[in-house]
Interface confidence: low
């Protein structure tokens, strides 16, 4: 296993009673220094399983705005530009962490929350169930 | 913008100096009550733009394990099961929030960090640049 030696300069921790509360610095460090976040912004239109992006806003959550992908078609777009229903457009989902204000409307107190978001769509071969 | 009325029962906030530090309850609430997180686990294989999942582990981060998608092919899989290079497999990326232990090795002190992860791949029509 990996041993994490404790840093002697850590803030004092409270006892192990739950729910456990920690200090989080909200001055976000962005590791994506060499990336252009818009570089994949046209994939939703050019994909064979295109999707629309829906804005989900919640002022009690951080980030307050999350974009949800909804596949445009049940099938996928073929070479002729038509929907081929022998294939399926499906959402690619990911669990992400958000911060939820708790108690509500408090600027300095949050709870960690996991939510499932659809990031985009991909085209898959359907699972066909043959009935005897 | 939306004004959030302050709850009188909020914990006392410190002064507004930055970096801003807040209290976060780490007993994660999971909103995905009706979802099976593994339900899309076979899309990576069934997609026309299949991908492999690479494990990225960092004990100084939460979540400590993140899975990164890497597209298997430059092209997409056609109806015959061959790679069609007239189409492109591309990663769908998303910025996510993680918690980074700061100072390092501290169990009760974190900094919010944004990282870009590839969640899966989708098949797109390539942008063709015609040279005069």
């Amino acid at each position: 296993g990996i041993t994490i030696p404790r840093n002697p300069g850590c803030p004092n921790s409270e006892d192990k009673n739950f729910p456990r509360t920690v200090m989080v610095n909200l001055n976000i460090h962005n590791r994506n220094t060499n990336t252009n976040p818009k570089r994949s912004s046209d994939y939703y239109n050019r994909s064979t399983s295109p999707w629309n992006l829906h804005r989900n806003e919640d002022p009690e959550r951080y980030p307050s705005v999350i974009w949800e992908a909804k596949c445009r078609h049940l099938g996928c777009i073929n070479a002729d530009g038509n929907v081929d229903y022998h294939m399926n457009s499906v959402p690619i989902q990911q669990e992400i962490l958000v911060l939820r204000r708790e108690p509500p409307h408090c600027p300095n107190s949050f709870r960690l929350e996991k939510i499932l978001v659809s990031v985009g769509c991909t085209c898959v071969t359907p699972i066909v169930h043959h009935v005897a | 913008g939306i004004t959030i009325p302050r709850n009188p029962g909020c914990p006392n906030s410190e002064d507004k100096n930055f970096p801003r530090t807040v209290m976060v309850n780490l007993n994660i609430h999971n909103r995905n009550t009706n979802t099976n997180p593994k339900r899309s686990s076979d899309y990576y294989n069934r997609s026309t733009s299949p991908w492999n999942l690479h494990r990225n582990e960092d004990p100084e981060r939460y979540p400590s394990v993140i899975w990164e998608a890497k597209c298997r092919h430059l092209g997409c899989i056609n109806a015959d099961g061959n790679v069609d290079y007239h189409m492109n497999s591309v990663p769908i990326q998303q910025e996510i929030l993680v918690l980074r232990r700061e100072p390092p090795h501290c169990p009760n002190s974190f900094r919010l960090e944004k990282i870009l992860v590839s969640v899966g791949c989708t098949c797109v029509t390539p942008i063709v640049h015609h040279v005069a």
């Epitope: 669990e95 | 994660i28 609430h29 995905n32 979802t35 997180p37 009760n108």
Partner: nanobody
Framework: ESGGGSVQAGGSLRLSCAAS????????MGWFRQVPGKEREGVAA???????SYADSVKGRFTISEDNAKTTLFLQMNSLKPEDTAMYYC?????????????????????WGRGTQVTVSS
């Protein structure tokens, strides 16, 4: 946790842990152990779909399971060795990739019990 105790090498013990009141729908539950002065070691883990994984040191000897109501976690320990002597803790975290190692890595983000002592003499 309960079920700990003293046993001779080669013997068996069954640990149990009542896990109630958590809000996770997808979760990672499991057992880790610690010897004073040493690092925590993940032993076994089970996720909400029932998939199990084990540390190499206990594979084939220990079995993790939960009851039908998913409120009690068990660790059946067979063929015990002196090196299995430790304080054993059960833990639950909010899902994600579920192995004994990640259960320990992410302990700060879950709940764990007070522990039960297991002593194996040769």
């Amino acid at each position: 946790e309960s079920g700990g105790g003293s046993v001779q090498a080669g013997g068996s013990l069954r640990l149990s842990c009542a896990a109630s009141g958590y809000t996770y729908s997808s979760y990672c539950m499991g057992w880790f152990r610690q010897v004073p002065g040493k690092e925590r070691e993940g032993v076994a883990a089970i996720d909400s779909d029932g998939s199990t994984s084990y540390a190499d040191s206990v594979k084939g000897r220990f079995t993790i399971s939960e009851d039908n109501a998913k409120t009690t976690l068990f660790l059946q320990m067979n063929s015990l060795k002196p090196e299995d002597t430790a304080m054993y803790y059960c833990a639950i975290g909010g899902g994600g990739y579920c192995t004994p190692a990640t259960l320990v890595s992410d302990l700060d983000f879950g709940n764990w019990g007070r522990g039960t002592q297991v002593t194996v003499s040769s």
